[in-house]
């Protein structure tokens, strides 16, 4: 898979492949995988990709199901890259406070908060 | 600070306190704090709270500025709790795939993706 494919296109293609191979993937009756109990997905990327690893190890590879897992590993690579960018730029307090303010603002309006 | 205050109210109050104490907080001319370079805030919670810790250690405490940092530490506690819930429930593959599909769907529509 060319890593040059834009991440947004990669995500779309992966969603389609997930639908295509759903029947094959759910065939394992006994397998249990940790599932986050809330919808703040970005907090759980580590566990999600651990789950994908578990699923991959239990799935017969070949054809486009292999492409699905390759795509998922490229998405993981992208997210790992984003995580690295969390601490790259050292800035003045003012700029950190602007970022913190936006973070709290997003938390206030977009997060699914259960008290 | 009563920990019973709903997290959503806590976030709102913290945003207000951040505005109130901004002038005091930015007074440090030389301090530099890592600022994430993208808007996917949830991926960067660790770095954001490390930055808050740096800022707290450089800020004269007392009065409501102390309350600001107490609030921020309660928000961190909430987020740490959310992170714990990422791997608590073991479920069938079907359920994991539903979550994965939702995660990719959110990534597709809501994440700020730079290729």
């Amino acid at each position: 898979i060319p890593t040059e494919i834009p991440t947004s296109a990669l995500v779309k293609e992966t969603l389609a492949l997930l639908s295509t191979h759903r029947t094959l993937l759910i065939a394992n009756e006994t397998l249990r995988i940790p599932v986050p109990v809330h919808k703040n997905h970005q907090l759980c990327t580590e566990e999600i990709f651990q789950g994908i690893g578990t699923l991959e190890s239990q799935t017969v590879q070949g054809g486009t199901v292999e492409r699905l897992f390759k795509n998922l590993s490229l998405i993981k690579k992208y997210i790992d890259g984003q995580k690295k960018k969390c601490g790259e730029e050292r800035r003045r307090v003012n700029q950190f406070l602007d970022y913190l303010q936006e973070f709290l603002g997003v938390m206030n309006t977009e997060w699914i908060i259960e008290s | 600070i009563p920990t019973e205050i709903p997290t959503s109210a806590l976030v709102k109050e913290t945003l207000a306190l951040l505005s109130t104490h901004r002038t005091l907080l930015i007074a440090n001319e030389t301090l530099r704090i890592p600022v994430p370079v993208h808007k996917n805030h949830q991926l960067c919670t660790e770095e954001i709270f490390q930055g808050i810790g740096t800022l707290e250690s450089q800020t004269v405490q007392g009065g409501t500025v102390e309350r600001l940092f107490k609030n921020l530490s309660l928000i961190k506690k909430y987020i740490d709790g959310q992170k714990k819930k990422c791997g608590e429930e073991r479920r069938r593959v079907n359920q994991f795939l539903d979550y994965l599909q939702e995660f990719l769907g959110v990534m597709n529509t809501e994440w700020i993706i730079e290729s």
Epitope: E89, R91, R92, N94, Q101 | V35, K39, I112
Partner: antibody, heavy 117, light 109 residues
Amino acid sequence: QVQLQESGPGLVKPSQTLSLTCTVSGGSISNGGYYWSWIRQHPGKGLEWIGYIYYSGSTYYNPSLKSRVTISVDTSKNQFSLKLSSVTAADTAVYYCASLGNWFDYWGQGTLVTVSS
Amino acid sequence: SYVLTQPPSVSVAPGQTARITCGGNNIGSKNVYWYQQKPGQAPVLVVHDDSDRPSGIPERFSGSNSGNTATLTISRVEVGDEADYSCQVWDSSSAHVVFGGGTKLTVLG
């Protein structure tokens, strides 16, 4: 390599509003490490900071211009804009857009705006 | 608001040392940035955080900052150094940017 390009009319009539846009390429305007700034330079004079904006919309303006200045950001177009109202001949200058990290890293080439009837 | 004062002009012969000052109340407690601007061009950073040089800037450019004065020093001045030089700080009480008035460096000869 981040590049910035100013665009807008080179001639504005007195009392009207000066409007300029800066297009950012080679990087995202949503980069949390940068403010996006406007600076001007009157003919033969020094640099004058006008203001800057964060991708979230937080703005900071030069107190001497604050009543007339609006800076806005459009993350979907990777652009930010300057509006300066009620202009006079004293607003004739080269206007630069620039990215501001800990210092001004990247600059546009500048655009001359003349205020004249 | 915070004010930075620079001499309007400084003249120096090639090979000599030019010193351009930037005065401000207790400027030594702030980080100072210096920009070089040649006619018809955008400014270019030559010194940041008082005395650090960005990559690509010759070692001949150096800076210092203490008390009420920051200084940009250009040693072994060359004809190509002729330009306007501006100092800049952040006024951290307001998060505003402040520039000095600029100094025109003339290389004699």
